[in-house]
Structure formats: C-alpha cells, structure tokens
C-alpha cells in the first residue's frame, strides 16, 4: 500500500478552521489523484469531503463542501472550515492514484483535530 503521512495533532483556530498537510509517497507517476477526508469518532467512520484533481491543478471540492485545498507535488494542503467542538475527532487522509494505471491507495494514520468553541462575549452595560 502507498504510504500517506499527516500530522498527529492540529488545533482549530477560533473561527473553527483547521489546516493540515497530507503527503503521499507515490510509487508511480500519477496524473489524476483523488483525496478523501474521513472522520473517525466512536468507531464510526464518515466521509467529510473528497476531491479528484489533475496534478498541477487546483483541488475542486463540491460547492457545499466544508473543505478547500491546494496541491503541490505529492503534498495536499487541506483546510476544513466551520468546525465546532462537537466535530473534534480523528480526521484521516485517504489518497488514491486514479490515472494512469495501476491504481494505488493509501490511508494516513489520521490527524486529531481539537476544536474549542469560543466563549461568548460577556454583555457590557
């Protein structure tokens, strides 16, 4: 399987945005890559977002996706927005080399994203 590396821990900022790099060791020479972010919480795995991109081009997520990203070589810079405390969990990067063949797939160990909801501002008299 293809090796995928990602940071162990990331802290979301006060606006609920977290960014991390997903890096893969490509065994071949892929021109089309699919990146999927999975969230694992309480042994449940759900897909957060996915994008397929051509090497050298921008990642294109669906319009309503909470993810954005850029690619550079074998690195993908992923940003997840709109996170709240309840979204704290393990975010796993899955990379698939789609074209040309052969197909390769790799899954990272996951990035634990901690999200702390901002304290509401106290009312001022």
């Amino acid at each position: 399987a293809m090796h995928v590396a990602q940071p162990a821990v990331v802290l979301a900022n006060s606006r609920g945005t977290a960014s991390f790099v997903c890096e893969y060791a490509s065994p071949g020479k892929a021109t089309e890559v699919r990146v999927t972010v999975l969230r694992q919480a309480d042994s449940q795995v759900t897909e957060v977002c996915a994008a397929t991109y051509m090497m050298g081009n921008e990642l294109t997520f669906l319009d309503d996706s909470i993810c954005t990203g850029t690619s550079s070589g074998n690195q993908v810079n992923l940003t997840i927005q709109g996170l709240r405390a309840m979204d704290t969990g393990l975010y796993i990067c899955k990379v698939e080399l789609m074209y040309p063949p052969p197909y390769y797939m790799g899954i990272g160990n996951g990035t634990q994203i901690y999200v702390i909801d901002p304290e509401p501002c106290p009312d001022s008299d």
């Epitope: 065994p27 074209y99 040309p100 052969p102």
Partner: antibody
Framework: EVQLLESGGGLVQPGGSLRLSCAAS????????MSWVRQAPGKGLEWVSG????????GYADSVKGRFTISRDNSKNTLYLQMNSLRAEDTAVYYC???????WGQGTLVTVSS | QSVLTQPPSASGTPGQRVTISCTGS?????????VHWYQQLPGTAPKLLIY???NRPSGVPDRFSGSKSGTSASLAISGLRSEDEADYYC???????????FGGGTKLTVLG
Amino acid sequence: EVQLLESGGGLVQPGGSLRLSCAASGFTFSDYYMSWVRQAPGKGLEWVSGISWSSRDKGYADSVKGRFTISRDNSKNTLYLQMNSLRAEDTAVYYCTTDLARYWGQGTLVTVSS
Amino acid sequence: QSVLTQPPSASGTPGQRVTISCTGSSSNIGAGYDVHWYQQLPGTAPKLLIYGNDNRPSGVPDRFSGSKSGTSASLAISGLRSEDEADYYCAVWDDSLNGVVFGGGTKLTVLG
C-alpha cells in the same frame, strides 16, 4: 472475489460488427481503469483499448483506432467494446482486464472469417 | 514488433534459477512507470505474477521476484519447477501511446 465475465464474441464476416461486454463484480468497478487485451491464436498479448474510471481518458492501439470504441457504465459495473469494420487479423480471444491487467476474465473468442 | 523487448525463449533444469529480461524506453519503464509480470499457463488466461516492479500478489510463491533499473526490468524464478513451464509477459504504461504495452512474451521450458 473479483470476477470479470466477457460475452458477445462469435463468428462474424469481414467488415462486420460485434459488441463485447464485460460484467464485473467483487471490487469497486468505478474506481478502476479498465482495458481490453487480445491474443491471436498462437501469438502474444496485445493491449487493444483502455478507459479511465470516469471515462475521461480513452486510449486505443494503432491497429484498432477509428474502428473500435470503448465505453463503460459504472452504474451497471460493465465495460464494453464496440468493434466495427472487422478484419481477419482481429481474430483473437478478447480479455477484459481491470487496472493494469491485475485481474483477467476468461476471455471471449472473436473469429472474423468469410 | 513489441514496444517492450523480451527474449522469445528461456530454459532451465529443476532447481535452477532463470531470469527473463524486459527492455523498454524513456516513454515507459524509463519514465518511472511500474512494471508488471504475467504468467500464462497453456490453455488458460494470463495471471498477474508481479505487481509494481517487485510485489507479489497473495498466493504467488516467493520463488518469483521482480526488479527494475533504468529502462529495463527482470523477472527471476529460483528453484525452478516443472509447473513453471509457461509463457511470461511484462507490461507497463506508455506515455507516448497513452496506453498499456506488453512484451512479446518469453516461453519458459523446464528441461528434464
């Protein structure tokens, strides 16, 4: 278990047409590049045509370009090869393969003869 | 004529080690693409033997090994057995053809 089942082969006259189908199961068909590879009697393997997972990229061997058309239906897990203007030299066993020929079907025989 | 060049035949006695070469060019093996090897026993469909230069699918004995260097690749079979008598093919992606290319095949004969 991965299974690839080809059908549609048979005897056809020169200039005629045939449509081969390959029903796939046991893997996520929509993730993989798929190919047709043929083997003429007593000869080696020849890649005929291939198609990417999304159908965006298609390729053909020079020997079949303009005569054969590859397509796929990911909702039906099926690969197709439309063969027109068939020639005697197209006589072969046609194999359906997934990825870079990671898995192979058992093949279907196409005989072009008058 | 095949884009990948293989010797048409090879032979060895039981227990011996034999090597089959596969020579390509800068648009396929030399471009960094992975080489794959297939075994075709008489009257059967080909079967994947080596995946991605040197990886064996489950069920393939470790007597079979692959390697790649520059624009060439090799398949080695050690401890040759009579059941290894078959045709062997290499294959790789080719940039200039936008497709897969196969070697012409090597017929392996196990003597004695």
